[in-house]
């Protein structure tokens, strides 16, 4: 029975040209995490395998950095990076857990303007 839950950073926004950390956390299960996949739409961005460590997609190796932890850092953001990102935890014996993050990449001035109205 799958008892675990995934907590994510939820909906986030970042500035064009900047960087952002995508984070997920699996809790409420004793299952062993064997691999974490980071995906955007149907594209595999990166893998963190328990035995083999991090592997980054050849298409994204200049803009994606592993970590911190099992998270993923996206760099040199463009408006095209806006969209859904998924962390997929492969575990034993539970199976697969999936978390969703929505990233909106904003033009610099919009991101700055929006920041003024954030509730502390």
């Amino acid at each position: 029975m799958m008892t675990g839950t995934i907590e994510t950073t939820g909906n986030i926004s970042a500035e064009k040209g900047g960087s952002i950390i995508l984070q997920c956390h699996l809790s409420s299960t004793t299952a062993q995490v064997t691999q974490v996949n980071w995906e955007q739409q149907d594209q595999l961005l990166a893998i963190c395998n328990a035995d083999l460590g991090w592997h980054i997609s050849p298409s994204f190796k200049d803009r994606v950095a592993p970590g911190p932890g099992l998270g993923l850092t996206l760099q040199s953001l463009t408006v095209n990076d806006t969209g859904e990102y998924f962390c997929i935890y492969h575990t034993y014996p539970d199976g697969t857990y999936t978390g969703r993050i929505f990233l909106e990449v904003l033009e610099s001035s919009v991101a700055e303007h929006g920041a003024r109205f954030q509730i502390p």
């Epitope: 149907d42 595999l44 893998i47 083999l52 050849p58 492969h90 034993y92």
Partner: antibody, heavy 120, light 110 residues
Framework: EVQLLESGGDLVQSGGSLRLSCAAS????????MTWVRQAPGKGLEWVST???????YYADSVKGRFTISRDNSKNMVYLQMNGLRAEDTAVYYC??????????????WGQGTTVTVSS | QSVLTQPPSASGTPGQRVIISCSGT????????VNWYQQLPGTAPKLLIY???QRPSGVPDRFSGSASGTSASLAISGVQSEDEADYYC???????????FGGGTKLTVL
Amino acid sequence: EVQLLESGGDLVQSGGSLRLSCAASGFSFWGYAMTWVRQAPGKGLEWVSTIAGNSYTYYADSVKGRFTISRDNSKNMVYLQMNGLRAEDTAVYYCAKDRSFYNYYDIDVWGQGTTVTVSS
Amino acid sequence: QSVLTQPPSASGTPGQRVIISCSGTNSNIGSNHVNWYQQLPGTAPKLLIYTNNQRPSGVPDRFSGSASGTSASLAISGVQSEDEADYYCAAWDGSLNGWVFGGGTKLTVL
């Protein structure tokens, strides 16, 4: 849509060689282990070889030293070089995709197979 | 001889519940996920159950899987004539460093 298309099967003399190819499409090929499974006429499925995303290789004892699995991530191709073929290698050879970068997960997609016939 | 043990045949009448067993060892079923494949006559195998009990999209919910210890089973509740096929269990074997399959079970719908 994930697709695997095998080719290279043929009729060959005992002791001969063949190279099977598998063209993959519809997924981020670099991030998944690939496997060859065979099925002799009227028999069950038999694992032949697996290659992880980082090119770690695994072989069944029955083919070790005779068969070589390889992959070209830039071309989305996996190959099986078969040398020293024997009559008992006669089978339909299936190319299959794993759900993980490494191994021990689930073979989730199969090609339609290519037929190898070894005559003695 | 297959590493995983399955009955060679199983049968049922339409609407009946059919269970196919698969027995292994600690190094395969006991420590890794079990998969079930359906192979219709003249076609390639198709994933039916993965990670012991998960169904891929498109697989009818009459198919279910379970695993405990070193054994697994596939249940077909309300078997139908189109379910007539060969069924294989499989798991990664950590000692052999390879996939192991059951010998297959031929399901006949009477």
